[in-house]
Interface confidence: medium
């Protein structure tokens, strides 16, 4: 189910899967929501700790049981991932943080008249993930009204410092407010060059594109189909980036599909989940549970309801079935993608719908002249 | 759509074009995909054309001029017109279409979420109407799917503008006081969608209006939230399981 409560002055002990710097607990919670394994988080505001290295620390946690022991820590904030929380799932974060400098790679500096304009510039720059703005009253006159556009390897600040007359925030691309616009075209038989930022296995190019869209550093991708000539590279989704923000070259190549991140789309982004079921496909991963259910849709629902389940395979092999029910293998992996994709199997596979914003907890999404 | 702009691919993936193939083929109405096998539209689209065989439903398209004889389309298995709809009135202007074969969801062909039953408390501030209808009263069907941002108006305000007609609680109105932006002929049956909490919901079905985009003459839409029981009943009784994006 969906658990939205925050625990003040509490810190979850153990279970760490990742850590980063975030400006507040809500942003930390969002990062937990989108992390494939995070179920719980704890955040340390600047006021809660003297250790400068841990200030603004956001700790993402996993637990086999879905819970962890809470210890008292003054000022700390803990809570749950919003996986399974339907319409509350969003990567959009509009807040502007006053008196805070979010550090990263500064790749662009310009003079602007307001923090809103700085945020807009970040949103309209393909590489910008977050920004800092020195206000009119900043102590060094030459830096006043400077808008610094930034990025980092993980998409979150490499450090966060308390600094007067500086305001920081994140790009509003995940809010579908970018003016850049996006390329929705999928290019059949084309491979993009440039730097690979990650490699995952996906059943099709659309899943690859969605993963690219929600990966902090992916700007475009190339997917190698299941009939790609090199067996070890079949179903490989390469997430890519480049200095310019676009592929520096592309090669016509049979059985490859390329495209762009949809993060710069205006108005609407794809859901961060994959609803399609793939017949005749087996998704390999770490076994979470095996249960007998009636039909592949029930298997997907079971996976969705079990918060740690990332993907599933529903077997139709005679030895895996009892009367009308067959085995539903609930699985997970480190990155949320199958560790192996096999074809020609008797069964179907798919993903958990826990990140769909049309999940259980959302309300989904002439005469006088007729028209 | 009057006063609108071109839509882009995948922007309104629930929008469908209802076309009739007689001697020629033409677009008559819009509709909204609400499930793999279900389209929600206006009952008046079938006035005089209740034959299932003549209809072709195109989904996942942006430009009507791209449709060729090879373009895939869906055929109708069943037309369910609201039992209280009368050709002579504007009430209960709602119909369900069950498709012969379920559609796969893609980036360009996805269902719209439905509101919760009797949703009256939500204040929608970001609403859009889409369709291939006329761009002016005496216009013609547009090739590229048009979109326009239109504010909802209260039923009281709407009733003042339509003294000769009963604006019921099962209708919702949208328009600008000064006019200029509205749905028009050919947009009927299509969606009025509003984004709330980051999610698009089907708030209305394009139904009627005095002319198009006239000053102080808002568009009138069938209020989907008021028909949720009917939608659920029909989609469930038809195949035992709701095949659409129903509310929690």
């Amino acid at each position: 189910g969906c658990l939205t409560q925050l625990y003040e002055n509490a810190f979850f002990r153990g279970g760490d899967v990742a850590s980063m710097y975030t400006p507040n607990a809500q942003y930390c919670q969002m990062r937990c929501t989108f992390h494939p394994r995070c179920l719980l988080f704890s955040f340390l505001p600047a006021s809660s700790i003297n250790d400068m290295e841990k200030r603004f620390g956001c700790f993402l946690k996993d637990s086999v049981t879905g819970t962890l022991p809470k210890v008292h820590r003054t000022g700390a904030v803990s809570g749950h991932s919003l996986k399974q929380c339907g319409h509350q799932i969003s990567a959009c974060h509009r807040d502007i943080y006053k008196g805070v400098d979010m550090r990263g790679v500064n790749f662009n500096v310009s003079k602007v008249s307001s923090v809103e304009e700085c945020q807009k510039r970040c949103t309209s720059n393909i590489r910008c993930q977050f920004f800092s703005y020195a206000t009119q009253t900043f102590h060094k006159a030459e830096y006043r009204n400077n808008c610094l556009l930034k990025y980092s390897p993980g998409g979150t600040p490499t450090a966060i410092k308390v600094l007067s007359n500086v305001e920081s925030g994140f790009s509003l691309k995940p809010c579908a407010l970018s003016e850049i616009g996006c390329h929705m075209n999928i290019f059949q038989h084309l491979a993009f060059s440039d730097v690979d930022v990650a490699r995952v296995l996906t059943p099709d190019a659309f899943v690859c594109r969605t993963i690219c869209t929600y990966h902090p550093n992916c700007l475009f991708f190339t997917f190698y189909t299941n009939v790609w000539k090199i067996e070890s590279q079949r179903n490989v989704c390469l997430l890519k980036t480049s200095e310019s923000g676009t592929p520096s070259s592309s090669t016509p190549q049979e059985n490859t599909i390329s495209g762009y991140s949809l993060l710069t789309c205006k108005r609407t982004l794809p859901e961060p989940c994959h609803s399609k079921i793939y017949p005749g496909v087996d998704f390999g991963g770490e076994e979470l549970n095996v249960t007998f259910v009636k039909g592949v849709n029930v298997c997907q629902e079971t996976c969705t309801k079990m918060i740690r389940c990332q993907f599933f395979t529903y077997s139709l092999l005679p030895e895996d079935c009892k009367e009308e029910k067959c085995k539903c293998f609930l699985r997970l992996s480190m990155d949320g993608s199958p560790t192996r994709i096999a074809y020609g199997t008797q069964g179907s596979s798919g993903y958990s719908l826990r990140l769909c914003n049309t999940g259980d907890n959302s309300v989904c999404t002439t005469k006088t002249s007729t028209r | 759509i009057v006063g609108g702009t071109n839509s882009s691919w995948g922007e309104w993936p629930w929008q469908v074009s209802l076309q009739v193939k007689l001697t020629a083929q033409r677009h008559l109405c819009g509709g909204s995909l609400i499930g793999h096998q279900w389209v929600l539209t206006a009952a008046h689209c079938f006035d005089g054309l209740p034959l299932q065989d003549v209809w072709r439903i195109y989904s996942g398209i942006l430009n009507l001029s791209d449709i060729t004889k090879d373009t895939p389309f869906s055929q109708i298995k069943e037309i369910i017109i609201h039992q209280n709809y009368k050709v002579s009135e504007g009430n209960h202007d709602i119909a369900l279409i069950k498709l012969q074969a379920p559609l796969n969801y893609t980036e360009f062909q996805k269902p719209i979420c439905l509101p919760s039953k009797g949703d009256t408390s939500t204040i929608y501030t970001n609403c859009w109407v889409t369709g291939w209808g006329f761009s002016k009263e005496k216009g013609e069907i547009q090739n590229i799917l048009q979109k326009v941002n239109i504010p909802l108006v209260t039923n009281e305000e709407c009733q003042k503008r339509y003294q000769d007609y009963k604006i019921t609680q099962r209708m919702v109105c949208a328009g600008y006081k000064e006019g200029g932006k509205d749905a028009c002929k050919g947009d009927s049956g299509g969606p009025l969608v509003c984004k709330h909490n980051g999610m698009w919901r089907l708030v209305g079905i394009t139904s009627w209006g005095e002319g198009c985009a006239r000053r102080e003459q808002p568009g009138v839409y069938t209020k989907v939230a008021e028909y949720m029981d009917w939608i659920l009943e029909k989609t469930q009784s038809s195949d035992g399981k709701a095949q659409m994006q129903s509310p929690a």
Epitope: F187, E254, N255 | -
Partner: antibody
Framework: EVQLLESGGGLVQPGGSLRLSCAAS????????MMWVRQAPGKGLEWVSG????????VYADSVKGRFTISRDNSKNTLYLQMNSLRAEDTAVYYC???????????????WGQGTMVTVSS | DIQMTQSPSTLSASVGDRVTITCRAS??????LAWYQQKPGKAPNLLIY???TLESGVPSRFSGSGSGTEFTLTISSLQPDDFATYYC????????FGQGTKVEIK
């Protein structure tokens, strides 16, 4: 009926420029990868350039890279080839062709125009 | 780039003969190969795609085979209309044609 009709060929001096057009009809032009292929007198076929459906991706043979530019206007159902810095070895019949994609796979140049002759000579 | 080598470059044959043309790719192209027929002054005409799939409307006397790097086009019984030049073309990576095989009357 599916048709591709090339135009714009002619005699041009070395170093000169020429713009070829290819008008398409009978199919949804905007959905397809379009190509230019040429054939020098008495010689074989040589792929020159290709453009993907949206126009965002263009590819060229090494022999014309930097000199030729392929483009398309989907609203006009027309493909173009802008040829600059022309050389004697560019003399050929230039064909436009389209590459069907999708299932069933039809990934070769299965529809061709009749060609337009370009002669580069002083 | 992938090179395509056709052989023979010229082939003399009579009506009714069985004719075979081979095409070799410089690296594996799986089955991404097409065969074209071209007559003087005309555009090429697609005969076979994906190495062995006959284009609709093409007579069944034409057949293709092979995968990887070795491919053949076979005309089982040469007809008067078949005297022309034949080209193979790979479309695995970019697009490359063979140099052509001219089939002439013996």
């Amino acid at each position: 009926e599916v048709q591709l009709l090339e135009s714009g060929g002619g005699l041009v001096q070395p170093g000169g420029s020429l713009r070829l057009s290819c008008a398409a009809s009978g199919f949804t032009f905007s959905h397809y990868i379009m190509m230019w292929v040429r054939q020098a007198p008495g010689k074989g076929l040589e792929w020159v350039s290709g453009i993907y459906s949206s126009g965002g991706i263009t590819v060229y043979a090494d022999s014309v890279k930097g000199r030729f530019t392929i483009s398309r206007d989907n609203s006009k159902n027309t493909l173009y080839l802008q040829m600059n810095s022309l050389r004697a070895e560019d003399t050929a019949v230039y064909y436009c062709a389209y590459r069907r994609t999708g299932v069933p796979r039809r990934d070769s140049f299965d529809i061709w125009g009749q060609g337009t002759m370009v002669t580069v000579s002083s | 780039d992938i090179q395509m080598t056709q052989s023979p470059s010229t082939l003399s044959a009579s009506v009714g003969d069985r004719v075979t043309i081979t095409c070799r790719a410089s690296q594996s192209i799986s089955s991404w190969l097409a065969w074209y027929q071209q007559k003087p002054g005309k555009a090429p005409n697609l005969l076979i795609y994906k190495a062995s799939t006959l284009e609709s409307g093409v007579p069944s006397r034409f057949s293709g085979s092979g995968s990887g790097t070795e491919f053949t086009l076979t005309i089982s019984s040469l007809q008067p209309d078949d005297f022309a030049t034949y080209y193979c073309q790979q479309y695995n990576t970019y697009w490359t044609f063979g140099q052509g095989t001219k089939v002439e009357i013996k």
